[in-house]
């Protein structure tokens, strides 16, 4: 069972995934985000199910693509550089779900653009964190 | 169906520039991010970079920076990769390939190739 | 730099025979890898995409599977036409890296 620290812990690296996943739906609906139109071409694909944190794997999955977009977003519109946004994302996705457990990820037939993408993890997120406090 | 057409065979000498040219079919080259890799031969193969032609911004590999150019032209939806100050080393088979985030899952991956060009430096 | 090992260098096998190649990551990588198919005078192929996922047009033998940082590439029934060299790839971050590949032979 988890303990009060785990869980506090767990909490925590929640609460600072969805504060960035926050951060980059900021910037890319930033009025001036000259780029907009075409990050919303990009595809990104949904989990199925995403209710528990082993379902983190199908974000893991578009962490690379996410990258690619926000490389076309000027820089200003972020604290951190795509690269080392996105990199401390995956620190943090891989301690939440765990690195041994493989789980596959299934995806919804219908894709999302990067603003419905990032609306759905940070739904996830903020669901998580209220079955923890 | 997208496909990648390479220019020819080249033959350099020690010091020289090579271009090599890939014209994309079937789409718009702006649809894709442009990598090139090569392989020595009988060897592995090996990533150099990306651009975007979109934007022409680039990726490079370590290795090739400073010495490789990757450009794009989106009026001919044709990549280049020009390698300079070429060594006997740089004799290989150069590929062209793609990867896209507008299509589906498996288009993220190097799904389509090109032919590839044969690039021999040699005194 | 991520290194990809892949074992063994060359595998010798009948038609028939189940492959098993094997590529092992020197880090996390997720699934961000890739398998492919190359024949002599060719471009690789891709077979298999985020570790398992089957490309379009790849017969149903080739399969791919993950084991932390460990990657299998199986073939369940060799076809004459499965003879070639294979390489992993990975795309967890750039320089993308390839495997130094395993070559495939009939025995």
């Known amino acids: 069972a988890p303990t009060s620290s785990s869980t506090k812990k767990t909490q925590l690296q929640l609460e600072h995934l969805l504060l960035d996943l926050q951060m980059i739906l900021n910037g890319i609906n930033n009025y001036k985000n000259p780029k907009l139109t075409r990050m919303l071409t990009f595809k990104f694909y949904m989990p199925k199910k995403a209710t528990e944190l082993k379902h983190l794997q199908c974000l893991e999955e578009e962490l690379g693509p996410l990258e690619e977009v926000l490389n076309l977003a000027q820089s200003k519109n972020f604290h951190l550089r795509p690269r080392d946004l996105i990199s401390n994302i995956r620190v943090i996705v891989l301690e939440l779900k765990g690195s041994e457990t493989t789980f596959m990820c299934e995806y919804a037939d219908e894709t999302a653009t990067i603003v419905e993408f990032l609306n759905r993890w940070i739904t996830f997120c903020q669901s998580i964190i209220s079955t923890l406090t | 169906q997208v496909q990648l057409v390479q220019s020819g065979a080249e033959v350099k000498k020690p010091g020289a520039t090579v271009k090599i040219s890939c014209k994309v079919s079937g789409d718009t080259i702006t649809a894709y991010y442009m990598h090139w890799v090569r392989q020595a031969p009988g060897q592995g193969l090996e990533w150099i970079g990306r651009?975007?032609?979109?934007?022409?911004?680039?990726k490079y590999a370590e290795n090739f920076k400073g010495r490789v150019t990757i450009t794009a032209d989106t009026s001919t939806d044709t990549a280049y990769m020009e390698l300079s100050s070429l060594r006997s080393e740089d004799t290989a088979v150069y590929y062209c390939?793609?990867?896209?985030?507008?299509?589906?899952?498996?288009?993220?991956?190097?799904?389509?190739w090109g032919q590839g060009t044969l690039v021999t430096v040699s005194s | 730099d991520i290194v990809l090992t892949q074992s063994p260098a060359t595998l010798s096998l009948s038609p028939g025979e189940r492959a098993t190649l094997s590529c092992q990551a020197s880090?996390?990588?997720?699934?961000?890898l890739s398998w492919y198919q190359q024949k002599p005078g060719q471009a690789p192929r891709l077979l298999i995409y985020?570790?398992?996922s089957l490309a379009s047009g790849i017969p149903a033998r080739f399969s791919g599977s993950r084991s932390g940082t460990d990657f299998t590439l199986t073939i369940s029934s060799l076809e004459p036409e499965d003879f070639a060299v294979y390489y992993c790839?990975?795309?967890?971050?750039?320089?993308?890296?390839f495997g130094q590949g395993t070559k495939l032979e009939i025995k």
């Open positions: 790839l990975q795309h967890y971050s750039t320089p993308y890296t």
């Open positions: 390939t793609t990867i896209t985030f507008l299509y589906s899952r498996e288009l993220r991956w190097f799904a389509y």
């Open positions: 651009i975007d032609p979109d934007d022409d911004s680039t």
């Open positions: 985020s570790a398992t």
């Open positions: 880090q996390y990588i997720g699934n961000y």
